[in-house]
């Protein structure tokens, strides 16, 4: 399946010339990524990332998805993608629309994970998974 479609999803990447990430964070394209080893629900995962001065990852390009898949263990990780049931569409937490494909969709699965498969997978927001946080490199 086509994970990303070719239309503009309304997200503009922030230009950053930094290359320094905190300890335990991974650097990619002027951004820093933290892959947790503990697990929690999606809401708690959002708060977890906030506590590190970051947000759940916005995986809005195929290159970023591949980078993260390459460094994930055989685990599922929450990302900053949620299903807006009233709109019948997926949005990133920065409110930009995701027009690509999400597998494993179910009326109770309103959050998304990456990691075990090559795609974005719908998941219950209440189940505990690891999480990927993202922030600007300094």
């Amino acid at each position: 399946p086509q994970i990303f479609n070719k239309s503009n999803d309304g997200f503009t990447t922030t230009r950053s010339y930094g290359t320094v990430c905190p300890k335990d964070w991974e650097f990619y394209q002027a951004r820093c990524f933290f892959l947790s080893t503990s697990e929690s629900s999606w809401n708690e995962s959002r708060d977890f990332c906030k506590g590190k001065g970051s947000t759940l990852a916005i995986v809005n390009t195929p290159e970023k998805l591949k980078f993260l898949q390459d460094i994930t263990d055989a685990e599922k990780y929450f990302i900053g993608l949620i299903y807006h049931r009233e709109e019948k569409r997926w949005r990133w937490i920065n409110n930009s629309v995701f027009n690509g494909n999400v597998t494993n969709q179910n009326q109770n699965f309103n959050c998304a994970t990456i990691g075990l498969t090559k795609t974005f997978d719908a998941a219950s927001c209440d189940i505990s998974y690891r999480r990927i946080c993202e922030k600007n490199a300094k």
């Epitope: 300890k23 503990s38 506590g51």
Partner: antibody, heavy 119, light 111 residues
Framework: QSLEESGGGLVQPEGSLTLTCTAS?????????MCWVRQAPGKGLEWIAC????????SYYARWAKGRFTISKTSSTTVTLQMTSLTAADTATYFC????????????WGPGTLVTVSS | NIVMTQTTSPVSAVVGGTITINCQAS???????LSWYQQKPGQPPKLLIF???KLASGVPSRFSGSGSGTQFTLTISGVQPDDAATYFC????????????FGGGTEVVVK
């Protein structure tokens, strides 16, 4: 899950000592750092150093500890702290603590081992 | 390096009362790096609160944490005699440039 320190005791000024921290009930892995913290008699806690408990060999030190103290992971269950050029100011109870990399807290502590520097 | 400054000791409490202990960071920190510990004489510290407000496993709910930026607070509601101890805050992040830092400790006396 527990930690236990060993190797403390009486040491002469300018002497050296190596403390060992042994983990039981869990393996040292990528989820943790292992740290040393000390407490002089009647005083507060002072962070000394931490080392990655997993595949990385990264170690981090308090500025005052660099050069005189060396932290090392020596096996899947042990971490050591080598101390040199000891003075009376180093007299303290030395604690080993497990540092959670996700939450940046020290969630498991050993009972401590007393180091006394005196002639 | 970040310096953590705590409420001056000792703090007196009455059984059933409420006390707060403050911890001030010398510069703004992410709340995810702040934890609280209880230590009794002859014992190692015990983790009470992590991520500024999350209760560690097995810790009574009368303990709570709050705060952000430079100001953090540990609150004990319904103080018990067993709560007599010294309490430390910890800025738990370290790297090649900065170290973890404990507050100086606050002794709590229960009357």
């Amino acid at each position: 899950q527990s930690l236990e320190e060993s190797g403390g005791g009486l040491v002469q000024p300018e002497g050296s000592l190596t403390l060992t921290c042994t983990a039981s009930g869990f393996d040292l892995n990528n989820y943790y750092y292992m740290c040393w913290v000390r407490q002089a008699p009647g005083k507060g806690l002072e962070w000394i150093a931490c080392t990655h408990a997993g595949s990385s060999s990264s170690s981090y030190y308090a500025r005052w500890a660099k050069g005189r103290f060396t932290i090392s992971k020596t096996s899947s269950t042990t971490v050591t702290l080598q101390m040199t050029s000891l003075t009376a100011a180093d007299t303290a109870t030395y604690f080993c603590a497990r540092h959670d990399r996700d939450y940046d807290d020290m969630d498991l502590w050993g009972p401590g081992t007393l180091v006394t520097v005196s002639s | 390096n970040i310096v953590m400054t705590q409420t001056t000791s000792p703090v007196s409490a009455v059984v059933g009362g409420t006390i707060t202990i403050n911890c001030q960071a010398s510069q703004s920190i992410e709340y995810g790096y702040l934890s609280w510990y209880q230590q009794k004489p002859g014992q190692p510290p015990k983790l009470l609160i992590f991520y500024a407000s999350k209760l560690a496993s097995g810790v009574p709910s009368r303990f709570s944490g709050s705060g952000s930026g430079t100001q953090f607070t540990l609150t004990i509601s319904g103080v018990q005699p067993d709560d007599a101890a010294t309490y430390f805050c910890l800025y738990g992040y370290f790297d090649d440039y900065s170290g973890a830092a404990f507050g100086g400790g606050t002794e709590v006396v229960v009357k």
